[in-house]
């Protein structure tokens, strides 16, 4: 019996990320006796809920229960039955629900009420559903990637756990792109901030962090596209919009009522002499880039320096992990390699956008046309946001690491959210015990 491992006391947690375009359920596990250690929590499962984001269920709330069933049943299978009752479940809704709440608190409440009722029917320890703030989304994303990269650990290692991890304790900045918002969070060189709204202070594992964060609502890739369309249709001479952000030969009819449904297009709203218009792709990266830049107001800045729209942004500092849609889009375009320079990315985007739609459809036959059609815009938008919005340069581009997973866990706000709500990130450095008391006898 000398080397026989005792059954470990394992704990589980579930977080649902109710995003603007879809909902994902994440299951995390960790050894119970190590819950205050850094880096011990890891993701065991991601389940993507079939269908759109919960904000789209406002007219069909009776379908929410069925919508969540598959992934919640999957959680039931993955987590041992004996652990069900003590497994916390959290649902955090992000920018899609922030936008719905902006239109109507009643409708947002109704959706969340039905979500809560549905999740309460499962045998887990449901802890509530809420709309998280943009600040929280940014902060928890930053905590997640730095936790997974081992940046909070005081033990210096002679090996690296991930390819781009340096042995220093300098934290990574976090760049998160969703469908309806985008977040930038990092520790600036200068501790003082000109904008208290963008300042966060943390004490984690015995160390103080002064963090800058901002969430740009309406600047997620989907809402940015709606903004661009609403802006461009203002100057269209008829119901045809020749759009450089879509492949040559691509055609799609858009309802004006859909265009003006979101608060994000409010500033471009006007009475148009038609109810529908047709997008006709012309596939020109340079023109698309120019059109996208018009979404960023850089003419006004009440601070020493700004990102765009008058929002304070300190000088960029250190390495950044770019995840969520930053990663999904760049990965699809095969542009996530550390070796690909910003100039090369631009060159590849020019080539990709100019490819005829029929050719693109053939090359990517397995990809849904709705998603496939938008990669030219999304790639262009990402470049514009990072370079002109956040002021990365050709040189600092190499400090951006497009990250999908770290150590098998998805980069995103959900892990940081759970670590915080389960009190698994201590303010002080835990006293290290000489031996783990549960592993071997």
């Amino acid at each position: 019996t000398q080397n026989k491992a005792l059954p470990e006391n394992i704990k589980y947690g579930i977080v649902l990320d109710a995003g603007s375009s879809h909902t994902s359920l994440y299951i995390y596990k960790w050894p119970a006796e190590k819950e205050n250690d850094t880096g011990v929590v890891h993701q065991v499962e991601e389940c993507r809920v079939k269908g759109p984001g919960i904000s789209k269920y406002v007219q069909k709330v009776n379908e929410i229960g069925i919508y969540l069933t598959d992934c919640m049943e999957r959680a039931r299978e993955v987590i041992p039955r004996s652990q069900h009752q003590e497994t916390p479940v959290y649902l955090g809704a992000t920018a899609g629900m922030r936008l719905l709440r902006m239109e109507s608190e009643e409708l947002a409440d109704r959706v969340l009420d039905v979500v809560e009722r549905s999740l309460s029917n499962y045998p887990f320890d449901f802890q509530g559903a809420r709309i998280i703030t943009g600040q929280e989304e940014g902060a928890y994303g930053w905590i997640t990637i730095n936790y997974l990269l081992g940046k909070f650990s005081q033990k210096t290692r002679w090996f690296s756990i991930v390819p781009y991890e340096t042995n220093n304790q300098e934290t990574f900045g976090a760049l998160d792109l969703g469908g309806a918002s985008t977040q930038i969070t990092f520790v600036p060189q200068n501790q003082t901030t000109e904008s208290p709204d963008n300042a966060l202070q943390f004490r984690l594992y015995g160390k103080d962090y002064n963090v800058y964060t901002h969430s740009f609502l309406c600047y997620g890739k989907d809402q940015a596209l709606w903004q661009k369309l609403a802006k461009d249709i203002q100057v269209a001479s008829n119901e045809i919009l020749r759009d450089p952000c879509f492949h040559p030969g691509y055609k799609k009819v858009v309802n004006v009522s859909d265009l003006y449904k979101t608060p994000c297009t409010k500033r471009f709203e006007m009475t148009l002499p038609f109810q529908q218009f047709e997008i006709q792709g012309i596939g020109n990266y340079q023109q698309c880039h120019q059109s996208v830049l018009e979404l960023f107001n850089t003419s006004y800045c009440p601070y020493s320096q700004c990102a765009f729209n008058g929002i304070f942004l300190p000088p960029l500092q250190g390495d950044f992990g770019a995840f969520s849609a930053f990663y999904f889009v760049m990965n699809f375009l095969n542009l996530t390699s550390e070796k690909v320079s910003q100039e090369k990315v631009t060159e590849m985007m020019k080539k990709f956008c100019s490819q005829p739609w029929e050719e693109i459809k053939t090359s990517y036959a397995g990809v849904k046309e709705k998603y496939l059609s938008e990669y030219c815009f999304s790639g262009t938008y990402i470049l514009s946001l990072l370079l002109q919005g956040y002021h990365f340069t050709a040189d600092s581009w190499e400090h951006i690491h497009f990250i999908g997973k770290i150590q098998g866990s998805d980069a995103g706000w959900t892990l940081g959210y759970m670590l915080n709500l389960t009190n698994m990130i201590p303010a002080e450095q835990p006293l290290s015990t000489p031996l783990s008391h549960s592993t071997y006898v």
Epitope: V61, E103, E105, E106, T133, Q135, K266
Partner: antibody, heavy 116, light 111 residues
Framework: QVQLVQSGAEVKKPGASVKVSCKAS????????MHWVRQAPGQRLEWIGY????????TFNQKFKGRATITVDTSARTAYMELSSLRSEDTAVYYC?????????WGQGTLVTVSS | DIVMTQSPDSLAVSLGERATINCRAS??????????MYWYQQKPGQPPKLLIY???NQGSGVPDRFSGSGSGTDFTLTISSLQAEDVAVYYC?????????FGGGTKVEIK
Amino acid sequence: QVQLVQSGAEVKKPGASVKVSCKASGYTFTDYNMHWVRQAPGQRLEWIGYIVPLNGGSTFNQKFKGRATITVDTSARTAYMELSSLRSEDTAVYYCARGGTRFAYWGQGTLVTVSS
Amino acid sequence: DIVMTQSPDSLAVSLGERATINCRASESVDNFGVSFMYWYQQKPGQPPKLLIYGASNQGSGVPDRFSGSGSGTDFTLTISSLQAEDVAVYYCQQTKEVPYTFGGGTKVEIK
């Protein structure tokens, strides 16, 4: 906690303009719309319009269109309502209120008196 | 525009007694299963205070004696046991459609 603090009382001559401010604190300013409502002496409350602080887009009660302008300064977390071509019947208390469809938080009100 | 008609214009009720105020909309204020109907209390020199939202939900910090009911076009605000501090003007409001409109108000006094 959420607070909306409005500028002080104003006395204006007919034909002039007035600009009332509303400074917000205690929440993410760009996450909620800001509405403006007025109440003339002994009258019912009257909705003027609202602004989306996120991008400056606004919607007005047709009655005030062309005469009312609503703007924001997001860095100062402040919304403004300007009413032009004032007439005596514009004498009222003007309120800002935060909300999408639910006006849960109101400013203390700004009395605007139009008198020759 | 949706016209909101409140009744009565004024109401005198004894302390501890029930007060009932009605509000009728010129068309339904329901949408997506939600009633976009609100009740506010206003005391002299103060801004309105949200009492009820979504026709029947209590605003935060609102005493339990205030309740709302109704759907479609007909709504009621009830004060189950009138207290001295409830003397005020009460307004209904709809936000289903722009322009958002208010009722004419009901003045509640102590008999």
